[in-house]
């Protein structure tokens, strides 16, 4: 599940990882766009083991995965869910 959040919070990520995470370990992916107190885009992966990982938006694997999810969302497959929460 892919989620896009617009929040008024400052940056959430202190440390970012670039290591590939297999889909079966991922619960959902949260995207925090640049702005609203944070000068950079943030990607937060919520894992099925209940832990959270901040992923470097420049990491090749996450860019590739996002592209796959975008392609699926533009087709008839109802896999990703895009949520926009405006405070």
């Amino acid at each position: 599940v892919l989620e896009v959040y617009y929040t008024s919070l400052r940056c959430r990520c202190v440390q970012e990882s670039s290591v590939f995470i297999p889909r079966r370990f991922i619960d959902r992916i949260q995207i925090l766009p640049r702005g609203n107190g944070c000068p950079r885009k943030e990607i937060i992966v919520w894992k099925k083991n209940k832990s959270i990982v901040c992923v470097d938006p420049q990491a090749e694997w996450i860019q590739r995965m996002m592209e796959v999810l975008r392609k699926r969302s533009s087709s008839t497959l109802p896999v990703p869910v895009f949520k926009r929460k405006i405070p």
């Epitope: 297999p22 889909r23 832990s51 995965m65």
Partner: antibody, heavy 120, light 107 residues
């Protein structure tokens, strides 16, 4: 020090059954995915099955899922592989491995293996 | 299933040589590839994860690269203790699959 110790291997006749065990120490066993991987004599590595910490997600190699069952007992820090209707081609060294889901996501710790021989 | 085609199946090289092993996935596996070293009679050891990250304690002469379907494992300067069989593995999706292995020998 992390240790994974397999046991339960041995000689079994075709059609027979065997239950392998893997005892874990030095890790918080209940937190990690675990896998079984086998290696036939002189051959490469073949993944058998994996199980998540809660035993709620289990995946098998398609060719083995009807005969093999992976399970775990977190209270005993143990992983198991029940093998039924064994065939000669199941002869192999069977390894248990920790599949890290916190940092590496690959199999970072392996046992020394236990040998299964299926022969009449 | 995703097939991992590893080549060469064996190779002979001299101490100090640069050694390269390739692995080709039958479909996109993103960067979900690991490389393992196995010495005779021993369990495999993780060397590289996420296609290009060295595992803890692995010497810097070992490296990996690639994404999608094409992956490379390199030993920059072969040492006598590197004699072993090397395997690639995709952990992008189940069933997890390994390459056929590359047996490395010293000339």
């Amino acid at each position: 020090e992390v240790q994974l110790v397999e046991s339960g291997g041995g000689l079994v006749q075709p059609g027979g059954s065997l239950r392998l065990s893997c005892a874990a120490s030095g890790i918080d066993f209940s937190r990690y995915w675990m896998s079984w991987v086998r290696q036939a004599p002189g051959k490469g590595l073949e993944w058998v099955a994996e199980i998540n910490p809660e035993s709620s997600t289990i995946n098998y190699a398609p060719s083995l899922k009807d005969r093999f069952t992976i399970s775990r007992d977190n209270a005993k820090n143990s992983l198991y592989l029940q093998m039924n209707s064994l065939r000669a081609e199941d002869t192999a060294v069977y390894y248990c491995a920790r599949q890290d889901d916190t940092r590496y996501y690959a199999m970072d710790y392996w046992g020394q293996g236990t040998t299964v021989t299926v022969s009449s | 299933d995703i097939q991992m085609t590893q080549s060469p199946s064996s190779l002979s090289a001299s101490v100090g040589d640069r050694v390269t092993i390739t692995c080709k996935a039958s479909q996109d596996v993103n960067t979900g590839v690991a490389w393992y070293q196995q010495k005779p009679g021993k369990a495999p050891k993780l060397l590289i994860y996420s296609a290009s990250y060295r595992y803890t304690g692995v010497p810097s002469r070992f490296s990996g690269s690639g994404s999608g379907t094409d992956f490379t494992f390199t030993i920059s300067s072969l040492q006598p203790e590197d004699i072993a069989t090397y395997y690639c593995q995709q952990y992008y999706s189940t069933p997890l699959t390994f390459g056929g292995g590359t047996k490395l020998e010293i000339k």
